[in-house]
């Protein structure tokens, strides 16, 4: 199991900047369509955050399809997309605290919290349910702990967050992250698995923040939340590396990392555009 094939690595940087799409179609999966032609086209991959080649069948498909690599980059990438955010955990707020509220492109509107840099406090906002950016927290407490100034500057303690009650939750409603660990990945990795509202039974994976592992669950096909991945590998890539182990001696911050030294990516496996 590749999950066990890990080593300790000192963290020097965090995730890529939060994914903020210029056009919503850039989030669509590559779609070769029903026809049988073999045509070289390009699409924007939200996992790698790069324009990549794919084979198009010649008909139908979707708007995430471009004749050239240049056209794809022009439509879907930003100049700073590959810049790594550097952050000093003990003194500074994470960079994402300074991002503006971003409702994302979906329409399953829910209450979330963001750090308002103008008022210097965490406030609620209307979130669409997908994409957006990392200045997005499920609870006021989580937002305050990460982004508001504590008595000694940026606080990294007490990262545990209370999980919302959701239908068919697979994780406890009120769960604190063990004190030995702190979570610095996407906030949805801390949310319970959510079957959603439809009737399908699709095999998916969610990150169980209590046990620190990706676990299977049955997804209904619509709704739910972003803690929802089509493969265990994508789940691990998105959430597993967020857990930072605190080592008291010398104060080194370490994390478990797979040997493959890829950057942590924010995974948006499915994008559900729905009206509540």
């Amino acid at each position: 199991d590749s999950e066990e094939d890990e080593e300790h690595t000192i963290i020097t940087d965090t995730e890529l900047p939060p994914l903020k799409l210029m056009h919503s179609f850039c989030a669509f999966k590559a779609d070769d369509g029903p026809c049988k032609a073999i045509m070289k086209r390009f699409f924007f991959n939200i996992f790698t955050r790069q324009c990549e080649e794919f084979i198009y069948g010649g008909c139908e498909g979707n708007q995430n399809r471009f004749e050239s690599l240049e056209e794809c980059k022009k439509m879907c990438t930003r100049d700073n997309a590959n810049r790594i955010i550097k952050t000093t955990l003990q003194q500074e707020k994470p960079d994402f605290c300074f991002l503006e509220e971003d409702p994302g492109i979906c329409r399953g509107y829910i209450t979330r919290y963001f750090y308002n840099n103008q008022t210097k406090q965490c406030e609620r906002f209307k979130y669409g349910g997908c994409l957006g950016n990392m200045n997005n927290f499920e609870t006021l407490e989580e937002c305050k702990n990460i982004c508001e100034d504590g008595p000694n500057g940026f606080q990294v303690d007490n990262y545990g967050t209370q999980l919302n009650a959701v239908n068919n939750s697979l994780t406890p409603q009120s769960t604190k992250v063990p004190s030995l660990f702190e979570f610095h990945g996407p906030s949805w990795c801390l949310t319970p698995a959510d079957r959603g509202l439809c009737r399908a039974n699709e095999n998916r994976f969610y990150y169980n923040s209590v046990i620190g592992k990706c676990r299977p669950f049955k997804y209904s096909g619509c709704g739910g939340n972003e803690n929802n991945f089509t493969s265990k590998q994508e789940c691990l890539r998105a959430c597993k590396k967020g857990f930072i182990q605190r080592i008291s001696k010398g104060g080194l911050i370490k994390t478990k990392r797979k040997r493959k030294k890829q950057r942590v990516k924010i995974a948006y496996e499915e994008i559900f555009v729905k009206n509540m």
Partner: antibody, heavy 119, light 108 residues
Framework: EVQLVQSGAELKKPGASVKLSCKAS????????MHWVRQAPGQGLEWIGE????????NYNEKFKTRATLTADKSTSTAYMELSSLRSEDTAVYYC????????????WGQGTTVTVSS | EIVLTQSPATLSLSPGERATLSCSAS???????LYWYQQKPGQAPRLWIS???ILASGVPARFSGSGSGTKYTLTISSLEPEDFAVYFC?????????FGQGTKLEIK
């Protein structure tokens, strides 16, 4: 003392528009959300939308998005709600209510404005 | 949108009796985001309970709230004359924010 004082009753014909006001005092107007909620005769409460005056952030109930317009005048600490294309079912008492930026505890309410739509 | 269904629509009880008002949500809502308001005739609603169980300022201790997921309850342990009013549940977990249709608590 926190107070929300609303404008007087309105009688309108179908198809017309109405603009209601809510003057706030006793607190920092720009630091709170102002909500608009209506109550038809003998009915429940219906949320129309909210506005945060400092940055002009507005959230509408989709049902009212095409007909309701929320605005705020920071200089007079007054919130406004305009409702267009009025119909008889818009007959209701319209309330303004404030809440903090972190929750939706509507802790202070205006006295309400009665809007009657009749031909 | 989340539909909140309150039951019963009208509850007729005498002072001193125990009252149980229910609020059922069409989908699960966070207990932190479930509130109750009291309204008396000719008056604006008043915030009564926040976060499922936290009594607003000035609300007597005979009131209590409980619940989670889709089922929430407001309980009055022993009714006093001033408790007779309409009570609305309210959720702000999802947009648009919604209210129940209300339960009228009347004197028997």
């Amino acid at each position: 003392e926190v107070q929300l004082v609303q404008s007087g009753a309105e009688l309108k014909k179908p198809g017309a528009s109405v603009k209601l006001s809510c003057k706030a005092s006793g607190y920092t107007f720009t630091s709170y959300w102002m909500h608009w909620v209506r109550q038809a005769p003998g009915q429940g409460l219906e949320w129309i939308g909210e506005i945060k005056p400092d940055q002009g952030r507005i959230n509408y109930n989709e049902k009212f998005k095409t007909r309701a317009t929320l605005t705020a005048d920071k200089s007079t600490s007054t919130a406004y709600m305009e409702l267009s294309s009025l119909r008889s079912e818009d007959t209701a008492v319209y309330y303004c209510a404030r809440s903090s930026v972190v929750d939706v505890a509507m802790d202070y309410w205006g006295q309400g404005t009665t809007v009657t739509v009749s031909s | 949108e989340i539909v909140l269904t309150q039951s019963p629509a009208t509850l007729s009880l005498s002072p001193g009796e125990r009252a149980t008002l229910s609020c059922s949500a069409s989908s699960s809502v966070s207990s932190s985001y479930l509130y109750w308001y009291q309204q008396k005739p000719g008056q604006a609603p008043r915030l009564w309970i926040s976060g499922t169980s936290i009594l607003a300022s000035g609300v007597p201790a005979r009131f209590s709230g409980s619940g989670s997921g889709t089922k929430y309850t407001l309980t009055i342990s022993s009714l006093e004359p001033e408790d007779f009013a309409v009570y609305f549940c309210h959720q702000w977990s999802f947009y648009p924010f919604t209210f129940g249709q209300g339960t009228k608590l009347e004197i028997k």
